[in-house]
């Protein structure tokens, strides 16, 4: 047998429960235990009793299933209903109930505003048992109360599937006004009306609002919170705040700056990232936006050439990214480039102009009068042409590229030759006999390869055939010449 001295003389702490603010409901607690899984309730209660209104916090028993024994009704004792205290003070409150020991299965928990308080840091339940009754005192303490602790607190005792609910204890934490809405910084159009809003709450109520502009009160008479200040218009930047007053004192909102929208500052640091013969990639650093978002930018391009007419090309682009590729430019040309950006108020001045140059272009025309003939004795094909009339922008001629394609019995092979700029003729070795050779020539500058000439074809016979008649670039409209020997 196990023996030990009785402990009934001292109080027993119970479920140190709930931490304020931890409001999730634990649906698995006994407080919502279903009549399933074989856990039949040991005690049953009816919700009403003849001749007595049901008060909501009293468990009224009936005859139990075990037979004839009646269980007495239970109710929490009345306690203080409303506690008013200042922020940061400590508070402790409790509910108490005397439970006959025949109630052999109970749990007790704290609830706030309809949600169970979970956790274990601020509640303690103590028992004072004797032979017939156990006095239960459930205490809840909050150190340094905050506004979030405001609310209605109740104790719930669960006896099987019946609940006994205490009267609510309403905690009201009073303090300086607390802003729920403060004025916001704004960017406004000059001389245009706008509104600012300020809202603060207690308790204690009421809360009165004063508006302050650049350290001076705007309204002599306070307005009840919430307050909307209509400012008819400003010509220069101003700082606004609001003061919220209640019986505990005053709280001042943050100061907010109201800016006047203006045209943007010009962009800075226009930079060249990449130049080709016909395009220039630029970037820039936006200037100050004038308190209004950029809408778009304009890239202005002037050709720097005494002979040009000085006209300005304008390219519109989005404000972001701060980069633009200027296209359709002349090769080997100098340009002056500036950037301007706009917001809802207007265009900025143009950025400082920068100089940029395009690179050489490729030739725009092909070599002229291409002729091809067979020099059988040397087993060569002779090719002759005339230098194309290239523009200055194409740059200095550095040579020619010759393409010759050999076609025979379904086989095709292309070869490329490079010759210097001083040549106007070339010889290529015969690659295949009994085949057609197709020749095209392009001029080459540092800017690239120009267009190829129209193809000229010559038939290369089997060994032993002789012919020196040339093939030449056809006159416009004629079919490709093919010399058959």
């Amino acid at each position: 047998a196990i023996t030990e001295a009785r402990e009934e003389a001292k109080p027993y702490p119970l479920f140190p429960g709930p931490l304020p603010g931890s409001l999730q409901t634990d649906h698995t607690s006994l407080l919502s235990l279903p009549h399933t899984s074989g856990y039949q309730p040991a005690l049953m209660f009816s919700p009403t009793q003849p001749g007595r209104p049901y008060t909501g916090n009293v468990a009224i028993p009936r005859v139990t299933s075990a037979g004839s024994k009646l269980l007495p009704p239970l109710a929490f004792k009345h306690t203080v209903g409303h506690i008013i205290l200042s922020e940061h003070k400590d508070v402790k409150f409790n509910c108490s109930i005397s439970v006959p020991n025949i109630y052999q299965d109970t749990t007790i928990s704290w609830w706030k505003d309809g949600k169970e308080l979970l956790g274990a840091h601020h509640a303690i339940t103590q028992f004072y048992p004797d032979d017939e009754v156990t006095a239960i005192i459930a205490s809840f303490s909050i150190t340094s109360v905050q506004r979030s602790d405001n609310g209605s607190y109740i104790c719930k005792m669960k006896i099987n599937n019946e609940e006994i609910v205490s009267d609510p204890i309403y905690i009201e934490v009073q303090g300086l006004p607390h802003f729920t809405k403060q004025p916001e910084s704004m960017n406004v159009t000059r001389n245009t009306a706008f509104n600012l809003t300020c809202q603060a709450v207690g308790p204690p109520e009421p809360v009165n609002i004063f508006w302050v502009q650049n350290s001076s009160r705007v309204n002599e008479q306070p307005e009840k919170s919430p307050s909307v200040l209509t400012v008819p218009g400003l010509t220069e930047m101003a700082v606004f705040s609001c003061e919220a007053h209640n019986d505990k004192g005053l709280t001042v909102s943050k100061g907010v700056q109201i800016n006047i929208k203006a045209i943007p500052s010009p962009p800075t640091e226009v930079s060249i990232h990449n130049s080709t013969a016909h395009s220039i990639l630029i970037s820039w650093v936006p200037g100050f936006d004038g308190y209004s978002p950029f809408r778009n930018c304009s890239v202005q391009v002037k050709e720097v050439d005494p002979l040009s007419n000085g006209s300005v090309m304008i390219f519109n682009t989005s404000a972001s990214p701060h980069m633009y590729q200027i296209k359709q430019l002349q090769a080997l040309a100098n340009y002056s480039i500036g950037v301007s950006c706009m917001n809802e108020i207007g265009w900025s001045a143009v950025s400082p102009w920068i100089l940029a140059s395009t690179t050489e272009g490729a030739p725009s025309v092909a070599p002229l009068n291409v002729t091809v003939f067979l020099n059988e004795s040397r087993d060569n094909v002779d090719i002759r042409w005339m230098k194309p009339l290239t523009k200055r922008q194409a740059g200095e001629l550095v040579g020619y590229r010759i393409s010759h394609v050999w076609q025979s019995a379904g086989i095709s092979k292309e070869l490329l030759e490079e010759v210097g700029q001083n040549n106007s003729r070339a010889q290529i070795s015969v690659q295949v006999h009994n085949a057609t050779c197709t020749v095209r020539i392009a001029a080459v500058t540092k800017g690239g390869v120009g267009p190829f000439s129209d193809p000229v074809k010559i038939f290369i016979p089997a060994h032993g055939w002789v012919d020196h008649a040339p093939s030449s670039t056809p006159a416009p409209g004629n079919a490709d010449p093919v010399l058959i020997i």
Epitope: R6, Y39, A66
Partner: antibody
Framework: QVQLVQSGSELKKPGASVKVSCKAS????????MNWVRQAPGQGLEWMGW????????TYAQGFTGRFVFSLDTSVSTAYLQISSLKAEDTAVYYC?????????????WGQGTLVTVSS | DIQMTQSPSSLSASVGDRVTITCKAS??????VAWYQQKPGKAPKRLIY???NRHTGVPSRFSGSGSGTEFTLTISNLQPEDFATYYC?????????FGGGTKVEIK
């Protein structure tokens, strides 16, 4: 002082019944519920359920319905556990354990245990 | 059902050591956890109730802590008579459930 004294060991054949008693003294019997806990050889503790000693209402854990019956004789402050249709797997030590104070469900006093052996 | 996961399942320690046993509940059980000590062939003996309260007569070297889902039994300055098996019990929700036990053996 509080005491819970259980009946002695039992050796039973499969299919038979056994009734284990738990006699309480040193407190008001009807003020504290009585739990039953099983411990198979070399195993841990398993809660079987409890009986309200005032109303006689039993509550059974799953797995302990049907063949297991909790009962009381309040005149002699005794709780009983009866197991019928015994099986080999019912071989275990059975403990009665008193519920603690009102509003709590832990056990504050235990009987010394009764070994029930089921063997053919 | 609420599961109580007890760890470690066994441990070896010497007299004078500090021993910590933990129990994790599968759901929030507030502070409704008790701890019991059992020696071979004997009934369990109560140690701690409501997570942190020592029963009368239990030496002060036994202490309990925790709330919600994590609970700890600590034995500081282990004594020869403390070598036994320890069980936690959650008593917030039915069915009441025990941890699997921790056997404390002599190193």
């Amino acid at each position: 002082q509080v005491q819970l004294v259980q009946s002695g060991s039992e050796l039973k054949k499969p299919g038979a019944s056994v009734k284990v008693s738990c006699k309480a003294s040193g407190y008001t019997f009807t003020n504290h519920g009585m739990n039953w806990v099983r411990q198979a050889p070399g195993q841990g503790l398993e809660w079987m359920g409890w009986i309200n000693t005032y109303t006689g209402e039993p509550t059974y854990a799953q797995g302990f319905t049907g063949r297991f019956v909790f009962s009381l004789d309040t005149s002699v402050s005794t709780a009983y556990l009866q197991i019928s249709s015994l099986k080999a797997e019912d071989t275990a030590v059975y403990y009665c354990a008193r519920k603690g104070v009102t509003a709590a469900r832990y056990f504050d006093y235990w009987g010394q245990g009764t070994l029930v052996t089921v063997s053919s | 059902d609420i599961q109580m996961t007890q760890s470690p399942s066994s441990l070896s320690a010497s007299v004078g050591d500090r021993v910590t046993i933990t129990c994790k509940a599968s759901q929030n059980v507030r502070t409704a956890v008790a701890w019991y000590q059992q020696k071979p062939g004997k009934a369990p003996k109560r140690l701690i109730y409501l997570a942190s309260n020592r029963h009368t007569g239990v030496p002060s070297r036994f202490s309990g802590s925790g709330s919600g889902t994590e609970f700890t039994l600590t034995i500081s300055n282990l004594q020869p008579e403390d070598f036994a098996t320890y069980y936690c019990l959650q008593h917030w929700n039915y069915p009441l459930t025990f941890g699997g036990g921790t056997k404390v053996e002599i190193k």
